[in-house]
């Protein structure tokens, strides 16, 4: 297993609709054809997997149908979008990139993107 540098923004505020997008960029040392991207969430020392996708270079990322993540790739960049976020989902979202094929296997883990999520203010009751 060889190490690889992964860069991602430090802080992102999700939209009022609970959507956060950020780029995860990896310094590919070779010509990988198969890449696996995993998003991990760290909150209060607990790390959980949010979503993962394996893709062939030049093709779209395919997450599971029920995944809250979508993404596109361009060269050594992966544009990740996480939706359905609520205030309780605020946390550090870490991008993990694995170059699966051809060998050698490379692994890179970013420092994480702190995603802040603000629940929208409830609309005031209106009398008709």
């Amino acid at each position: 297993c060889k190490a690889m540098h992964v860069a991602q923004p430090a802080v992102v505020l999700a939209s009022s609709r609970g959507i956060a997008s950020f780029v995860c960029e990896y310094a590919s040392p070779g010509k990988a054809t198969e890449v696996r991207v995993t998003v991990l969430r760290q909150a209060d020392s607990q790390v959980t997997e949010v979503c993962a996708a394996t893709y062939m270079m030049g093709n779209e990322l395919t997450f599971l149908d029920d995944s809250i993540c979508t993404g596109t790739s361009s060269g050594n960049q992966v544009n990740l979008t996480i939706q359905g976020l609520r205030a309780m989902d605020t946390g550090l979202y870490i991008c993990k990139v694995e170059l699966m094929y051809p060998p050698p296997y490379y692994l890179g883990i970013g420092n994480g993107t702190q995603i802040y999520v603000i629940d929208p203010e409830p609309c005031p009751d209106s009398d008709f």
Partner: antibody, heavy 117, light 108 residues
């Protein structure tokens, strides 16, 4: 080193607007947020809101909603805070601070805004 | 809105003494999102502690933070002359982000 440098003191009349700038250096500007905090004379710190420089999304304190606008110019690594319809109780030192994963650091030196007729 | 209440309002101590500052939240705050700042007259606040207990870069080890849930503490083990200032706690886990009203540590 990481630094935030703010614009100078301003004197404004009630009802006017003020725009305070905060120029960042020493780090990747788009990777972090910028928060604004104010401090009235002899008082404590009041959080005004913040902007996620990466995507431009903002979160404002409810009491200032509609009067405050936070923006950034990524070409010059500068953040701006505009406050409209100024009142005498808006007289304060206005600070910008870099928002990291779980901290505000560093802070700008502060900009005194005096609202007086 | 989470209200942070700091106590005492003023702490009168001598250099070399131990200072214990309290910050109590009106509802639970994730310890990841609780910070302490020091402010001296005419200066901007300076980050001391983040994540309730992690010391910021360049902060001497006489400063320590602890606590979880609704009760947080900043401890200065041995007061130095330059430590006399106002200290604020802040939470940024729940919007609106809020500050405590401050504790002034003054020379006795």
């Amino acid at each position: 080193q990481v630094q935030l440098v703010q614009s100078g003191a301003e004197v404004k009349k009630p009802g006017a607007s003020v725009k305070v700038s905060c120029k960042a250096s020493g780090y990747t500007f788009t990777s972090y947020g910028i928060s604004w905090v104010r401090q009235a004379p002899g008082q404590g710190l009041e959080w005004m809101g913040w902007i996620s420089v990466y995507n431009g999304n903002t979160n404002y304190a409810q009491k200032l909603q509609g009067r405050v606008t936070m923006t950034t110019d990524t070409s010059t690594s500068t953040a701006y805070m505009e406050l409209r319809s100024l009142r005498s109780d808006d007289t304060a030192v206005y600070y910008c601070a870099r928002v990291g994963a779980n901290w505000f650091d560093p802070w700008g030196q502060g900009s005194l805004v005096t609202v007086s007729s | 809105e989470i209200v942070l209440t700091q106590s005492p309002g003023t702490l009168s101590l001598s250099p070399g003494e131990r200072a214990t500052l309290s910050c109590r939240a009106s509802q639970s705050v994730s310890s990841s999102y609780l910070a302490w700042y020091q402010q001296k007259p005419g200066q901007a606040p300076r980050l001391l502690i983040y994540g309730a207990s992690s010391r910021a870069t360049g902060i001497p080890d006489r400063f320590s933070g602890s606590g979880s849930g609704t009760d947080f503490t900043l401890t200065i083990s041995r007061l130095e002359p330059e430590d006399f200032a106002v200290y604020y706690c802040q939470q940024y886990g729940s919007s609106p982000w809020t500050f405590g009203q401050g504790t002034k540590v003054e020379i006795k």
